[in-house]
C-alpha cells in the first residue's frame, strides 16, 4: 500500500471524484500512521489552501470549484531527516463534477444480468466530450476512464463490464470531460442501477384469487421462499419498472411479499427476486414466469402507482 | 439538503458549564469539519476554532483555547461545543457551520443563546 | 491575525440600485475571501468564496472580485429581501477573521 519505504501513501475519502461545493478528505498514511503532512498540487494553481501549512491526520477540502480539480501528492513529516519531510506521495487526482451538461447512460443488453455475465455501459452526449468516465457508487478509487468517440455529433464510450459477480452490482453514473479540462468532468449523467441475479435460491410466485381472473377483479401476487430475503422484487415482461416490497415472515416460516396488482385489466408474464438488505442489488435466480391471464374486456395496461423506475433506486436501501 | 439544527437557548450562572450541541443531516457527517462562530452582543463574528469530523482532531483560536471544547459523537452526527468555568463575557450567540481546513462554512446552524448572569 | 476592515459599515439604497461593499485585509490574502448574508433574527448564510465563486443557490445579482489586499461584493440590482448585515471574511490563514460588517437598508 505503501509503495516504498520512505513514501506515504495519500489517498481521499470518500471518493477521488466530488460534486462541486462538496468535500473530501484527504489522508497522507505515513510509517504505519496518520502523521502531520504537507500537500501539494501538482499545476500549482490553487495553491493558497497550502501556504505551507502542516496538516494533521487529514485534510478536509471544500467547497470545492473547479480549481481544486488535479493532482495532488504529500510529504509526510520526519523530523530525524535532513528535510524534516518524507519523499513525496503516490499521485492523487481530484475531479470535480458539475462543470458541464450530464451525459446519458444505458446499458446493453440491460440492467439485469445473470451473474457471470457481461454488461456494456454506453455513456453519451451531443456536448463534444473528450474523455469519459464511469464511476461506481461508494467506491472512493479512480473511476474507469475511456476516449470519447464522436460520430454524427454524438460522442460517446463503451464501458465493458464483466463477467459480472456481485462485487461489481451498483449503481453507476458517467462522466464527460473536455480538452484541456481532463479533471473538469460534466455533471453526473442519472443513476443506473446494475443488478445481479442468479446467485440465490428462486422464490416461488402465486395469485391470488388465481392466476386467471375476471376483468375488474382485484389481484395480488404473492412472492415467498424459505430463505430469509429482506426484500422482493417484481417485474413484469415487457416493462421496464419493477415494483420492491419488504418480506414479512409468515407463520410457516416462510418470509413473503404481497404484491396488490389492483383491479384486472390487462394479463401478463411476472417473475419476482429475493435480495438481501446487505447486498441490495445482488438478486436470487428469478421464480418461475407467472401468466397472469384477464378473461372479460382487457384494455391498455394494469395501473402501477407505486412502481419506481428501474434506473434507480434499486440499489438503495428500502427504510 | 444539508442542514444543521443547535440545541435550545441556556441560561447559566458564572462558573457553571455549558454543552451546546448541533446536529448534521443532508451529507456525510465524516468528509467535512465542524466550524464554531461566536457572536458577543454589539460585536461582529469571531472564529472560535474548528473541529476535523474526519480524524476528531480540533484546533482552536487563541482566544478559545482552555475553556472551550469542541467534540463529535460520528455515530449520531453531531458535534458539540463545551464552555466550562463561564463568565459573564461568554453571553454570546454561539454558531456552528458545516468547514473544513480552507475555512469556508458554506451552511450554518441557527445560532444556540448563551446568556450567563448571577 | 489578519485584519479584514469592512466598509461602508452603513448603506442605504432604493430597490434596483447597485451597490459595492468593499474590504481591505491587512495582509495578501491570495483570493481566499468569503462573503456572508445573515438576515435580522438568522444565521449568516454564505454568498461568495474563493472571491468569485457564488454558493449553490446564490442569485447571480450578487457577485465578488479582487485580489491581494481588496475585494468587493457587489449586489447588482438590489431588491427588498436583500436587507441585512454582510460579512466579508478570510479563509487564507488561521485564525480565520471577519470584517465588522455592512448594514444594508432598503430607502
Known amino acids: 500500500l505503501m509503495g516504498g519505504q520512505d513514501k506515504p501513501f495519500l489517498s481521499a475519502r470518500p471518493s477521488t471524484v466530488v460534486p462541486r461545493g462538496g468535500h473530501v478528505a484527504l489522508q497522507c498514511h505515513y510509517r504505519r500512521g496518520f502523521n502531520n503532512f504537507m500537500l501539494y498540487k501538482e499545476d500549482r494553481s490553487h495553491v493558497p489552501i497550502f501556504h505551507g501549512r502542516i496538516f494533521q491526520e487529514s485534510f478536509i477540502m471544500g467547497p470545492v470549484t473547479p480549481a481544486h480539480a488535479g493532482t495532488y501528492r504529500c510529504r509526510g513529516s520526519r523530523p530525524h531527516s535532513l528535510t524534516g519531510w518524507s519523499a513525496p506521495s503516490n499521485p492523487l487526482v481530484i475531479m470535480v463534477t458539475g462543470n458541464h451538461r450530464k451525459p446519458s447512460l444505458l446499458a446493453h443488453p440491460g440492467p439485469l444480468l445473470k451473474s457471470g455475465e457481461t454488461v456494456i455501459l454506453q455513456c453519451w452526449s451531443d456536448v463534444m466530450f473528450e474523455h469519459f468516465f464511469l464511476h461506481r457508487e461508494g467506491i472512493s478509487e479512480d473511476p474507469s476512464r475511456l476516449v470519447g468517440q464522436i460520430h454524427d455529433g454524438v460522442s460517446k464510450a463503451n464501458f465493458s463490464i464483466g463477467p459480472l459477480m456481485p462485487v461489481l452490482a451498483g449503481t453507476y453514473r458517467c462522466y464527460g470531460s473536455v480538452p484541456h479540462s481532463p479533471y473538469q468532468l460534466s455533471a453526473p449523467s442519472d443513476p443506473l442501477d446494475i443488478v445481479i441475479t442468479g446467485l440465490y435460491e428462486k422464490p416461488s410466485l402465486s395469485a391470488q384469487p388465481g392466476p386467471t381472473v375476471q376483468a375488474g377483479e382485484n389481484v395480488t401476487l404473492s412472492c415467498s421462499s424459505w430463505s430469509s430475503y429482506d426484500i422482493y422484487h417484481l417485474s413484469r415482461e415487457g416493462e421496464a419498472h419493477e415494483r420492491r416490497l419488504r418480506a414479512v415472515p409468515k407463520v410457516n416460516r416462510t418470509f413473503q411479499a404481497d404484491f396488490p396488482l389492483g383491479p384486472a385489466t390487462h394479463g401478463g408474464t411476472y417473475r419476482c427476486f429475493g435480495s438481501f438488505r446487505a447486498l441490495p442489488c445482488v438478486w436470487s435466480n428469478s421464480s418461475d414466469p407467472l401468466l397472469v391471464s384477464v378473461t372479460g374486456n382487457p384494455s391498455s395496461s394494469w395501473p402501477s402507482p407505486t412502481e419506481p423506475s428501474s434506473k434507480s433506486g434499486i440499489c438503495r436501501h428500502l427504510h | 439538503q444539508v442542514q444543521l439544527v443547535q440545541s435550545g437557548s441556556e441560561l447559566k450562572k458564572p462558573g457553571a458549564s455549558v454543552k451546546v450541541s448541533c446536529k448534521a443531516s443532508g451529507y456525510t457527517f465524516t468528509t467535512a469539519g465542524m466550524q464554531w462562530v461566536q457572536k458577543s452582543p454589539g460585536q461582529g463574528l469571531e472564529w472560535m476554532g474548528w473541529i476535523n469530523s474526519h480524524s476528531g482532531v480540533p484546533k482552536y483560536a487563541e482566544d478559545f483555547k482552555g475553556r472551550f471544547v469542541f467534540s463529535l459523537d460520528t455515530s449520531v452526527s453531531t458535534a458539540y461545543l463545551q464552555i466550562s468555568s463561564l463568565k459573564a463575557e461568554d453571553t454570546a450567540v454561539y454558531f456552528c457551520?458545516?468547514?473544513?481546513?480552507?475555512?469556508?462554512?458554506?451552511?450554518w446552524g441557527q445560532g444556540t443563546t448563551v446568556t450567563v448572569s448571577s | 491575525d489578519i485584519v479584514m476592515t469592512q466598509s461602508p459599515s452603513f448603506l442605504s439604497a432604493s430597490v434596483g440600485d447597485r451597490v459595492t461593499f468593499t474590504c481591505k485585509a491587512s495582509q495578501d490574502v491570495s483570493t481566499a475571501v468569503a462573503w456572508y448574508q445573515q438576515k435580522p433574527g438568522q444565521s449568516p448564510k454564505l454568498l461568495i468564496y474563493w472571491t468569485s465563486t457564488r454558493h449553490t443557490g446564490v442569485p447571480d445579482r450578487f457577485s465578488g472580485s479582487g485580489s491581494g489586499t481588496d475585494y468587493t461584493l457587489t449586489i447588482s440590482s438590489v431588491q427588498a429581501e436583500d436587507v441585512a448585515v454582510y460579512y466579508c471574511?478570510?479563509?487564507?490563514?488561521?485564525?480565520?477573521?471577519f470584517g465588522g460588517g455592512t448594514k444594508v437598508e432598503i430607502k
Open positions: 457551520a458545516r468547514g473544513g481546513d480552507e475555512g469556508v462554512m458554506d451552511y
Open positions: 471574511q478570510q479563509h487564507y490563514s488561521t485564525p480565520w477573521t
